[in-house]
């Protein structure tokens, strides 16, 4: 390796590699300076002069140390479905994640593609599996002695009432009716609710509003309308 | 509250050098780049260029290359700018300006340079 | 360089009436970003993103715009409105303003 006080740009030594923060440039066949995040090569190195480095501009970023000649162009706004988790700098892109009541159908490195609205179990199905941030609610039938008499993506399905006299017996979408008595339940209620996915990014404390660009074609496309499954609602 | 506090008025005779500061307050100085804005008495304003703190590195409009150096002292969360060879051209007020992405959201008071012999 | 023009330099307007002023850049630009400066005092960061509003700024105030074409209108002026109002581009360096339009109350 070349002696600590090389300064860039500089030959390396025959089967010798650059340092920390540069690269070989072919053209120059000389280590120069990476331009640092946020940055981009605005002008490339020689024999004689190192790397020039400019910011980012406009909607534009760079994550990593790099000698690209232009930064990479922020993604599109999010669409009405999702949420900008982080918002685009000069040294990060843009992330969008799905709003509540929503989860990602359809992923990318960062963030989501493709939002799609969470399933809701119908009167006579429960929650056998919650929502998360990449997959959708799993309903299930009401056993009997449990029901739901809810259209929910959250709620499992609760043990019927225990009368002392019954007046109406409870089924899979109907608590039972007692008469006259108070009546006792077989067991304790438990969480009725289960949450909605909690994201697990951090949110931004003031995420800077989307720029305006040009328009284009967005990734985040609406979900169209698809067959309910088996004890789900489309509404 | 986000504030940068800049030095005072300089009084300096052609030909010689100045450096202005600006201390930043009220939020982490490397989590934004500090740019430099000159505005000429009853004029627009220019650009000179801006720093990322974290990386120390700069960006400058090529107008102001040689004239203006950009430096910042993480330790104190401030940002210099230091003008050489000046001439009257360069009698002006300097702001630094915070850069939240690609625009300035907090401003100094500005420094007032007048280069007169 | 991107040349940012603004027009008018000067303009007057009475009190509740509707102000425009213009930008344009010799070259597309994304965005654009709008100041606001009072007599002796520093800018104030106006409209940012083309048309999103910075904290404060009165809902009167919307910029609008595209390509090289953008402008900030004031639906109806008030006496605190008078000022200069200087538009920006981030889109290539050097990033530059325009020359301003002086914002009077006739």
């Known amino acids: 390796l070349p002696a600590q006080v090389a300064f860039t740009p500089y030959a390396p030594e025959p089967g010798g590699t650059c340092r920390l923060r540069e690269y070989y440039d072919q053209t120059a066949q000389m280590c120069c300076s990476k331009c640092p995040p946020g940055q981009h090569a605005k002008v490339f190195c020689t024999k004689t002069s190192d790397t020039v480095c400019d910011s980012c501009e406009d909607s534009t970023y760079t994550q990593l140390w790099n000698w690209v000649p232009e930064c990479l162009s922020c993604g599109s706004r999010c669409s009405s479905d999702q949420v900008e988790t982080q918002a685009c700098t000069r040294e990060q892109n843009r992330i969008c994640t799905c709003r509540p009541g929503w989860y990602c159908a359809l992923s990318k490195q960062e963030g989501c593609r493709l939002c799609a609205q969470l399933r809701k179990c119908r009167p006579g199905f429960g929650v056998a599996r919650p929502g998360t941030e990449t997959s959708d609610v799993v309903c299930k039938p009401c056993a009997p002695g449990t029901f739901s008499n809810t259209t929910s993506s959250t709620d499992i399905c609760r043990p019927h009432q225990i009368c002392h006299v019954v007046a109406i017996p409870g089924n899979a979408s109907m608590d039972a009716v007692c008469t006259s008595t108070s009546p006792t339940r077989s067991m304790a209620p438990g969480a009725v609710h289960l949450p909605q996915p909690v994201s697990t990014r951090s949110q931004h404390t003031q995420p800077t509003p989307a720029p305006s660009t040009a328009p284009g074609t967005s990734f985040l496309l609406p979900v169209g309308p698809s067959p309910p499954a088996e004890g789900s609602t489309g509404d | 509250e986000v504030q940068l506090q800049q030095s005072g008025a300089e009084l300096v005779k052609p030909g010689a050098s100045v450096k202005i500061s600006c201390k930043a307050s009220?939020?982490?100085?490397?989590?934004?780049?500090m740019d430099w804005v000159k505005q000429s008495h009853g004029k627009s304003l220019e650009w000179i260029g801006d720093?990322?703190?974290?990386?120390?590195?700069?960006s400058y409009n090529q107008k102001f290359k040689g004239k203006a150096t950009l430096t910042v002292d993480k330790s104190s969360s401030t940002a210099y700018m230091e003008v050489r060879s000046l001439t009257s051209e360069d009698t002006a007020v300097f702001y630094c300006?915070?850069?939240?992405?690609?625009?300035?959201?907090?401003w100094g008071a500005g420094t007032t340079v007048t280069v007169s012999s | 360089e991107n040349v940012l023009t603004q027009s008018p330099a000067i303009m007057s307007a009475s009190l509740g009436e509707k102000v425009t002023m213009s930008c344009r850049a010799s070259s597309s630009v994304k965005n654009m970003y709008w100041y606001q400066q009072k007599s002796d005092a520093s800018p104030k960061l106006w409209i940012y993103y083309t048309s999103n509003l910075a904290p404060g700024v009165p809902a009167r105030f919307s910029g609008s715009g595209s390509g090289n074409s953008y402008s900030l209108t004031i639906s109806s002026m008030e006496g605190e409105d008078a000022a200069t109002y200087y538009c920006?581009?981030?889109?290539?360096?050097?990033?530059?303003f325009g020359g301003g339009t002086k914002l009077e109350l006739k």
């Open positions: 720093i990322n703190p974290n990386y120390e590195s700069t």
């Open positions: 920006q581009q981030f889109t290539s360096s050097p990033y530059t």
């Open positions: 300006a915070r850069d939240k992405g690609w625009y300035f959201d907090v």
């Open positions: 009220g939020y982490t100085f490397t989590d934004y780049n």
